[in-house]
C-alpha cells in the first residue's frame, strides 16, 4: 500500500487464543496463518495491536461465539473494538451485538466489525466481549487485524 | 493503492452464481456490479480468485443463506475462506458459523469474513460452505473479493 | 494509501443518527470518533457519502438492529448498500439479511457489509434498511464508511 522505506506497508492479522484470565479483553497470538508486516505494528501483552505511526487505519475484528439463551444472561453477546491512545480516554470504536441462540447446548454465531479510524503514534486497539468463555477458538473463527491506508 | 506500472491497483469483487454442482465450493461470476482491476487477479473456473503477485491482500467474503433448524443437520452453517498455493498445504484462513434459524420455511442470515493475508504468486483463494443449496443469490447478498495493499 | 498532492488519502467513517424521518435510508453524522479525510469525500444531507474522484473504493457499513419476530413483518431485516451515480440508475451493491429474533422485547443482531467497487466522480453511496426504527444507535453499533484504494 505504501512503498519504499518512507511508506512501508503496515498490516497485522492475529489469531484468537483461549485464556484462563477472567478479563473481558480477548487474547491473541502470532500463530497459524498470521500477519505482522514489520515492527511498526506490534501485538502487546497478547491483547492489543499497537501502532508506531500516525495515520488512517482500517481496523477489523471477527468473533465467533457459542451461547445459549437459557444459560446466558438476559443481555446479548456484545463485541467491542476499543482504542487506547497515550494520554487520552479509552474509546469504543465499534460494537456489534447478537442475541443468544436457543440452540442446545449452544448456538454458534459470528460477528464482524470493521472501520477506518485515525490512530496516533502509540495508539493501541483491542477487543472486548461480554463473555470470553463463549468465544470459539477453532481455526479461523476469531481474528483481529488492521492495515494502514 | 499502487500507482504506476510497477504498482498497479489489484482488486476484485465477484458475484455469487447458483450452481448445480454438488461441491461445497461456492461459484462466482463477473456479472452485475463486479470489479476486476486487471489480469494480475483472475477468477478461475468460476470458483477461485488467483493472484499473480506476492504481497499482502485484504480478502473478504459475504455469504447470505436461508436455513431451518429442523430441515438442516445439527451442525451450524459454516462459511470458510480457504487458500491454496503452488507446492503448499491448503489452509483455512477464516471461518464463520451461524446456527440455523427456527423460522419457517427458512430464516435468512448473513456472514461476513475479512482479513489481511500474505499471498504467494499463483495463490488461489476460494469459499467453502457446509450447504451450498442454502446460499442466497439475490442481488448483492453473496459476494467475494480482495484488494492488494 | 495514496501519498502526495496527486494522491491524497480518501477515507470516511460516519456514525449513525436517529431520525424522525420515515425514509428507509439511514442517517449519518460526523460525530463521535468519525473520519473525514478531506473534501474529496463528503457526507451529503446526512445520508450519503459522495466522492469527487473516480477509482476503486472499499465501501462498508455495519448495522445493528433490535427486532422481534412477532412484532415484525414476516420478511427479514435487510440492509442494503446502494450506489447513485450522475446520470445512471441507482444500484444495489451489497445486501445482508437477518431473520428477526424470537427474544423479547427484541433481539439484537449485527450486520456487516463490505466490498470493492468502482465509483465515478460525483457518485454517492448510501444505506437502506427495511425498518429504520429497529436500528441501534448506541456508541459504535451502526456505522458507514469507505476508503479509496
Amino acid at each position: 500500500m505504501q512503498k519504499g522505506d518512507q511508506n512501508p506497508q503496515i498490516a497485522a492479522h492475529v489469531i484468537s487464543e483461549a485464556s484462563s484470565k477472567t478479563t473481558s479483553v480477548l487474547q491473541w497470538a502470532e500463530k497459524g496463518y498470521y500477519t505482522m508486516s514489520n515492527n511498526l505494528v506490534t501485538l502487546e501483552n497478547g491483547k492489543q495491536l499497537t501502532v508506531k505511526r500516525q495515520g488512517l487505519y482500517y481496523i477489523y475484528a471477527q468473533v465467533t461465539f457459542c451461547s445459549n439463551r437459557e444459560a446466558s444472561s438476559q443481555a446479548p453477546f456484545i463485541a467491542s473494538l476499543c482504542l487506547k491512545s497515550p494520554g487520552r480516554f479509552e474509546r469504543i470504536l465499534l460494537r456489534a451485538a447478537n442475541t443468544h441462540s436457543s440452540a442446545k447446548p449452544c448456538g454458534q454465531q459470528s460477528i464482524h466489525l470493521g472501520g477506518v479510524f485515525e490512530l496516533q503514534p502509540g495508539a493501541s486497539v483491542f477487543v472486548n466481549v461480554t463473555d470470553p468463555s463463549q468465544v470459539s477458538h477453532g481455526t479461523g473463527f476469531t481474528s483481529f487485524g488492521l492495515l494502514k491506508l | 493503492m499502487q500507482k504506476g506500472d510497477q504498482n498497479p491497483q489489484i482488486a476484485a469483487h465477484v458475484i455469487s452464481e447458483a450452481s448445480s454442482k454438488t461441491t461445497s465450493v461456492l461459484q462466482w461470476a463477473e456479472k452485475g456490479y463486479y470489479t476486476m482491476s486487471n489480469n494480475l487477479v483472475t477468477l478461475e473456473n468460476g470458483k477461485q480468485l488467483t493472484v499473480k503477485r506476492q504481497g499482502l491482500y485484504y480478502i473478504y467474503a459475504q455469504v447470505t443463506f436461508c436455513s431451518n433448524r429442523e430441515a438442516s443437520s445439527q451442525a451450524p452453517f459454516i462459511a470458510s475462506l480457504c487458500l491454496k498455493s503452488p507446492g503448499r498445504f491448503e489452509r483455512i484462513l477464516l471461518r464463520a458459523a451461524n446456527t440455523h434459524s427456527s423460522a419457517k420455511p427458512c430464516g435468512q442470515q448473513s456472514i461476513h469474513l475479512g482479513g489481511v493475508f500474505e499471498l504467494q504468486p499463483g495463490a488461489s483463494v476460494f469459499v467453502n460452505v457446509t450447504d451450498p443449496s442454502q446460499v442466497s443469490h439475490g442481488t448483492g447478498f453473496t459476494s467475494f473479493g480482495l484488494l492488494k495493499l | 494509501m495514496q501519498k502526495g498532492d496527486q494522491n491524497p488519502q480518501i477515507a470516511a467513517h460516519v456514525i449513525s443518527e436517529a431520525s424522525s424521518k420515515t425514509t428507509s435510508v439511514l442517517q449519518w453524522a460526523e460525530k463521535g470518533y468519525y473520519t473525514m479525510s478531506n473534501n474529496l469525500v463528503t457526507l451529503e444531507n446526512g445520508k450519503q457519502l459522495t466522492v469527487k474522484r473516480q477509482g476503486l473504493y472499499y465501501i462498508y457499513a455495519q448495522v445493528t438492529f433490535c427486532s422481534n419476530r412477532e412484532a415484525s413483518s414476516q420478511a427479514p431485516f435487510i440492509a442494503s448498500l446502494c450506489l447513485k451515480s450522475p446520470g445512471r440508475f441507482e444500484r444495489i451493491l451489497l445486501r445482508a439479511a437477518n431473520t428477526h429474533s424470537s427474544a423479547k422485547p427484541c433481539g439484537q443482531q449485527s450486520i456487516h457489509l463490505g466490498g470493492v467497487f468502482e465509483l465515478q466522480p460525483g457518485a454517492s453511496v448510501f444505506v437502506n434498511v427495511t425498518d429504520p426504527s429497529q436500528v441501534s444507535h448506541g456508541t459504535g453499533f451502526t456505522s458507514f464508511g469507505l476508503l479509496k484504494l
Epitope: - | 478461475e44 477461485q48 499463483g122 | -
Partner: antibody, heavy 116, light 111 residues
Framework: QVQLVESGGGLVKPGGSLRLSCAAS????????MYWIRQAPGKGLEWVST????????YSPDSVKGRFTISRDNAKNSLYLQMNSLRAEDTAVYYC?????????WGQGTLVTVSS | DIVMTQSPDSLAVSLGERATINCKAS??????????MHWYQQKPGQPPKLLIY???NLESGVPDRFSGSGSGTDFTLTISSLQAEDVAVYYC?????????FGGGTKVEIK
C-alpha cells in the same frame, strides 16, 4: 485412479519447436496446479513450469523463460508444454506431475532429443 | 534461487541396516510452521516416487521404514532397515520458493 500420460516427444533440430501433451484422468483436473519437470540423461531433476488450475497463472525458471510456454485445456483434461528455440541442453525426459505440497503423481515421461 | 545440497552422493548399506541421507538448503524453506521439503525415490527407467512431503509426512502407501525430519535448512531422510527394493536414487526438493529446486541425488546401494 490418477493417471498422467505424456506424449509429443521426439528428435528435433536446435532452434526447432515441439509441443508436449499430458493427458490426465482419475481426478478433477481443473482443481489442481500442474507441473512439468525434466531430467537430462544420467542427470538430476529440474523443474520446468507451473500452471494454476484455471490456467491464468504460469511460472517458469530463467533457463526456459521466453522459450517454453505451459498451458492447459480443462475441457480436454490436458496439459501442454510448447517448446520453442530448442537447444541441445533441453534434451531430457519430460514429466508432467501433480500434487501439493509434494509431487505425488507423475507420468512415465516423454523423451525430447535436440540434436543436429 | 535456493540451492539444495545433498550428501553423500552415494551410500552403500547392508540389508537391514539404517541409511541416512542429508539435504541442506541455502536458505530456510519454512513457512508458517511447515517445512516445504520433500523426498523422492527414483529407480532406473521410472519416474520419481514421492516418499515424504513437508519434511516429515509419509506419503500414502510408502512403507514406514522411511521417515523424514528437519526444519529450516537441514533435513534428513532415514531408511530404518534397508531392503533390497530400496536400491535407487533419492532426491530432495523444495517448494518454498520459485524456482523449485532439487538436490543432486544420492545413490543408495547394498553393501
Amino acid at each position: 485412479q490418477v493417471q498422467l500420460v505424456e506424449s509429443g516427444g521426439g528428435l528435433v533440430k536446435p532452434g526447432g519447436s515441439l509441443r508436449l501433451s499430458c493427458a490426465a484422468s482419475g481426478f478433477t483436473f481443473s482443481d489442481y496446479y500442474m507441473y512439468w519437470i525434466r531430467q537430462a540423461p544420467g542427470k538430476g531433476l529440474e523443474w520446468v513450469s507451473t500452471i494454476s488450475g484455471g490456467g491464468t497463472y504460469t511460472y517458469s525458471p530463467d533457463s526456459v523463460k521466453g522459450r517454453f510456454t505451459i498451458s492447459r485445456d480443462n475441457a480436454k483434461n490436458s496439459l501442454y508444454l510448447q517448446m520453442n528455440s530448442l537447444r541441445a541442453e533441453d534434451t531430457a525426459v519430460y514429466y508432467c506431475a501433480r500434487g501439493e505440497p509434494g509431487l505425488a503423481y507423475w507420468g512415465q515421461g516423454t523423451l525430447v532429443t535436440v540434436s543436429s | 534461487d535456493i540451492v539444495m545440497t545433498q550428501s553423500p552422493d552415494s551410500l552403500a548399506v547392508s540389508l537391514g541396516e539404517r541409511a541416512t541421507i542429508n539435504c541442506k538448503a541455502s536458505q530456510s524453506v519454512d513457512y508458517y510452521g511447515d517445512s516445504y521439503m520433500h523426498w523422492y525415490q527414483q529407480k532406473p527407467g521410472q519416474p520419481p516416487k514421492l516418499l515424504i512431503y513437508a519434511s516429515s509426512n509419509l506419503e500414502s502407501g510408502v512403507p514406514d521404514r522411511f521417515s523424514g525430519s528437519g526444519s529450516g535448512t537441514d533435513f534428513t531422510l532415514t531408511i530404518s532397515s534397508l531392503q533390497a527394493e530400496d536400491v535407487a536414487v533419492y532426491y530432495c526438493q523444495q517448494s518454498h520458493e520459485d524456482p523449485w529446486t532439487f538436490g543432486g541425488g544420492t545413490k543408495v546401494e547394498i553393501k
